[in-house]
């Protein structure tokens, strides 16, 4: 058993049918010694008397808010949550496996640049009685500070007969050095509590591996005289790291016909312009990627040919 926060405790339970459970001793936070009784949640049934209460925690029915009283007055509370292990594996029931980039991916994180700021998100089908708390650091043995905000509900989606809820959090490395080579990964830890169930989820990554630039901005077409060709130009996104001479991007320019089946013409360039043939009813799209490190491509920025 360990303390999650004041008066909230997590009992780690290795569960299997007929498991003996965990013996937990609760102590009433009071100088009083006599006439103390214990109850669980809203029930008035007296579970025991005395300054301490010993319970055997075998299942969620044994978890909840234990309260000690004297003469009708509440003396203190202890909320017991369960962290369940089955077959040697901690439960991961609260969050959905996003299965990308691999199975058992519960947290996904992205950074728009090298400033040390990043966003993580996760999915759940649970709509109520749910709280999250996020901590982060660079490295784990001698951790350097990363400050995370509060997790917020960022999207709701309907998936078949089910609703899916996306939560996200923004974090900022306290002393980020954008140009430095990373040697220690960022660690992100999410505590999730649903009703009386506690679970924790972790992710470890280098900022360079989670970079996903914003799409190029100010995408424009300039027709070339007496030609079907156009000059496409764009700019680095505002959110990308500066100077651009050091934090350089490479770009992919794509000409896509109205039909998805039509052949796509693609050009790769390090410049912020390219010359392409603009077909009728086609659109031109440009996306960006770090020039020197193969992290994610940005989403496409698009304009119609017409």
């Amino acid at each position: 058993i360990w303390e999650l926060k004041k008066d909230v405790y997590v009992v780690e339970l290795d569960w299997y049918p007929d498991a003996p459970g965990e013996m937990v001793v609760l102590t009433c936070d009071t100088p009083e010694e006599d006439g103390i009784t214990w109850t669980l949640d809203q029930s008035s049934e007296v579970l025991g008397s005395g300054k301490t209460l010993t319970i055997q925690v075998k299942e969620f029915g044994d978890a909840g808010q234990y309260t000690c009283h004297k003469g009708g007055e509440v003396l203190s509370h202890s909320l017991l949550l369960l962290h369940k292990k089955e077959d040697g594996i901690w439960s991961t029931d609260i969050l959905k496996d996003q299965k990308e980039p691999k199975n058992k991916t519960f947290l996904r994180c992205e950074a728009k640049n090298y400033s040390g700021r990043f966003t993580c998100w996760w999915l759940t089908t649970i709509s109520t009685d749910l709280t999250f708390s996020v901590k982060s650091s660079r490295g784990s043995s001698d951790p350097q500070g990363v400050t995370c905000g509060a997790a917020t509900l960022s999207a709701e989606r309907v998936r078949g007969d089910n609703k899916e809820y996306e939560y996200s959090v923004e974090c900022q490395e306290d002393s980020a050095c954008p140009a430095a080579e990373e040697s220690l990964p960022i660690e992100v830890m999410v505590d999730a509590v649903h009703k009386l169930k506690y679970e924790n989820y972790t992710s470890s990554f280098f900022i360079r591996d989670i970079i996903k630039p914003d799409p190029p901005k100010n995408l424009q077409l300039k027709p070339l005289k007496n030609s079907r060709q156009v000059e496409v130009s764009w700019e680095y996104p505002d959110t990308w790291s500066t100077p651009h001479s050091y934090f350089s991007l490479t770009f992919c320019v794509q000409v896509q016909g109205k039909s998805k089946r039509e052949k796509k013409d693609r050009v790769f360039t390090d410049k912020t312009s390219a010359t392409v043939i603009c077909r009728k009813n086609a659109s031109i799209s440009v996306r960006a990627q770090d020039r020197y490190y193969s992290s994610s491509w940005s989403e496409w920025a698009s304009v119609p040919c017409s």
Epitope: Y16, P17, E59, F60, D93, N162, K195, L196, K197
Partner: nanobody, 123 residues
């Protein structure tokens, strides 16, 4: 919302078997832990059995261990309770319940309930 409808109850002789079914509709059935409870006249609702959302883990009340088997078919959105070697003291209304906390024998840890199906065991 999850809607639960029990079926399969009836009158049987002691020592016989019965299979209860609980059909779920509404939100994704496979996200929920499922349980069976029962209530005899003049008594509190009593835990019978529970099954995890994956169906890989089951939990039983001591009074039914070895006689009752809970199972589920997530493709059919159905949970079953196979009851054998029935005794007169198994007579009760049997309720199906869905929740997110497994294992739990406490009724208020379940969020959704069916209307119940009567099982009568005569001696």
């Amino acid at each position: 919302e999850v809607q639960l409808v029990e079926s399969g109850g009836g009158v049987v002789q002691a020592g016989e078997s019965l299979r209860l079914s609980c059909a779920a509709s509404g939100r994704s059935f496979s996200d929920y832990e499922m349980g069976w409870f029962r209530q005899a006249p003049g008594t509190e609702r009593e835990f019978v059995a529970a099954i995890s959302w994956r169906g890989s883990s089951t939990y039983y009340a001591d009074s039914v261990k070895g006689r009752f088997t809970i199972s589920r078919d997530n493709a059919k959105n159905t949970v079953y309770l196979q009851m054998s070697s029935l005794k007169p003291e198994d007579t009760a209304v049997y309720y199906c319940a869905a929740g997110r906390l497994y294992p739990s024998s406490r009724s208020r840890d379940y969020d959704y309930w069916g209307q119940g199906t009567q099982v009568t065991v005569s001696s």
